[in-house]
Amino acid sequence: RAPRCRELPAQKWWHTGALYRIGDLQAFQGHGAGNLAGLKGRLDYLSSLKVKGLVLGPIHKNQKDDVAQTDLLQIDPNFGSKEDFDSLLQSAKKKSIRVILDLTPNYRGENSWFSTQVDTVATKVKDALEFWLQAGVDGFQVRDIENLKDASSFLAEWQNITKGFSEDRLLIAGTNSSDLQQILSLLESNKDLLLTSSYLSDSGSTGEHTKSLVTQYLNATGNRWCSWSLSQARLLTSFLPAQLLRLYQLMLFTLPGTPVFSYGDEIGLDAAALPGQPMEAPVMLWDESSFPDIPGAVSANMTVKGQSEDPGSLLSLFRRLSDQRSKERSLLHGDFHAFSAGPGLFSYIRHWDQNERFLVVLNFGDVGLSAGLQASDLPASASLPAKADLLLSTQPGREEGSPLELERLKLEPHEGLLLRFPYAA
């Protein structure tokens, strides 16, 4: 008799794929544009990335460091009107893209939460949650919560408001902290909170260190749903050299949880390559005319247009990974098992019941390595086959779809492999 199928877990929309942050509308749209009406015109691009949610803003009225002139219910007229916002919501809904609104109050000021009048600000946030929930927003983000006194209790209250409206609504909190204990203390009183942090931001050194960080986090958070990013707002290129971007894309899309990216991560947008551009929000490179300040500074392969035409580009890799992440059960909600593969490597399996299984092997080092996959580390339910099919490599040159012998697996410097193999009873 065939074994019984494992019962599927309840899946919220943010469990099904990546979130895409647009913190600065002007930088994202460029060319002196930067309003909600213009963003509506970019929704097809977001659809092509197969992201599930757009984390937008902040876009509310905020006079720098002035609580009285900060109104979380009013859209800054520079960004548009409530009608523009409503139109964006409706269009996003038609494309199955959820909209998450950033309500970080003093986003133009020194302290995101103002240094005084905590209760006043917290009341403003409560009002805003209720108002925007009723206006059709799918969730909220608040950043820099390390600057918010009694953050845990406020987050619990805001979570109650958000979930009280509908279980299908999401609250994201962001912190600059990379300390696991601080992160856990924020999480423990807030079930279902999605927390973005700088926890992985110093993981670029070795495969062992990354493996240690990831497994510690997953062990500490237990059955909680996680999010994966390198920071609460910044670009991947703020933390990683270009040669590791593909590796991290592969990792973020295949770890158990919600991957969270900032606009430009999909093309390797790098402020350092654009003189005069702010590190936290460089202009998005749609094409070579997006950065006219210095003629010739932008080549086609740095842009959305150029990378869209190149199947070997970072953007093409992002789209493929995003597609796999949103449709494969083992990547959607499968179990995770990390195991030893040799120094410099980080490897893990994702599997769900009798569905197709995935093996990820990541070489963080700058030398080629043979992988010594230690299958003995794995439970019986996640055993390795002798061969697995190559779904994709982060480096060009490998023949996709070809079976690879796992005992003889060799990885190029900074290469990541995503392999698939069937369930075997």
Epitope: L133, G136, S166
Partner: antibody, heavy 119, light 114 residues
Framework: QVQLQESGPGLVKPSETLSLTCTVS????????VHWIRQPPGKGLEWIGL???????NYNSALMSRVTISVDTSKNQFSLKLSSVTAADTAVYYC?????????????WGQGTLVTVSS | DIVMTQSPDSLAVSLGERATINCKSS????????????LTWYQQKPGQPPKLLIY???TRESGVPDRFSGSGSGTDFTLTISSLQAEDVAVYYC??????????FGQGTKVEIK
């Protein structure tokens, strides 16, 4: 118990500013918002605006250029100012509590105060 | 702005009989986010402020007699008084409290005893 009481001059001259106060008791101003509504004699209800617990305000766009709503938490009072009034602004003016989370329904109302605009 | 239209403008019903008031909105008042319908009913007796009867189209405010019930979804709504009492003589208003302001009222329906 929850109470709201409107007060202000019953007669205002055309082109002047109508000023009303709503004094509340029995609930916390940091937990509930307050609506202003008006009703011309023998007619229906018109929503003017809502001031939230945190001080944010939603206005009826038809009146927005003339209306100002504010709060003085130390006195448990809300105020409504309507400038450049005409005879069409003659009405009973009510304040009412926004009573429920995820709803703009008004669960407690003041008795209302009649304001007549006439020279 | 959402326009609310009530019918009839006035209604005369015998004591103990059913009274039905209709309200139509110019757009749907269903919030797909929480599947609630944002329609409120008020009762206003002569010389008094309005009184909240029903919110979310069908949720009775505490203390409101159960002879008052609200129904409907989308754009068409009904307030029913199952057995009219003398104290129910009043003007009844529906109000949209959906999404963005202004939160507009219907023109009112006057209920009298036949």
């Amino acid at each position: 118990q929850v109470q709201l009481q409107e007060s202000g001059p019953g007669l205002v001259k055309p082109s002047e500013t109508l000023s009303l106060t709503c004094t509340v008791s029995g609930f916390s101003l940091t937990s509930y918002g307050v609506h202003w509504i008006r009703q011309p004699p023998g007619k229906g209800l018109e929503w003017i605006g809502l001031i939230w617990a945190g001080g944010s305000i939603n206005y009826n766009s038809a009146l927005m250029s003339r209306v100002t709503i504010s709060v003085d938490t130390s006195k448990n009072q809300f105020s409504l100012k309507l400038s450049s009034v005409t005879a069409a602004d003659t009405a009973v003016y009510y304040c009412a509590r926004k009573g429920h989370m995820y709803s703009y329904a008004m669960d407690y109302w003041g008795q209302g105060t009649l304001v007549t605009v006439s020279s | 702005d959402i326009v609310m239209t009530q019918s009839p403008d006035s209604l005369a019903v015998s004591l103990g009989e059913r009274a039905t008031i209709n309200c139509k909105s110019s757009q749907s008042l269903l919030n797909s986010g929480n599947q609630k319908t944002y329609l409120t009913w008020y009762q206003q007796k002569p010389g008094q402020p309005p009184k909240l009867l029903i919110y979310w189209a069908s949720t009775r405010e505490s203390g409101v007699p159960d002879r008052f019930s609200g129904s409907g979804s989308g754009t068409d709504f009904t307030l029913t008084i199952s057995s009219l009492q003398a104290e129910d003589v009043a003007v009844y208003y529906c109000q949209n409290d959906y999404s963005y302001p202004p939160w507009t009222f219907g023109q009112g329906t006057k209920v009298e005893i036949k």
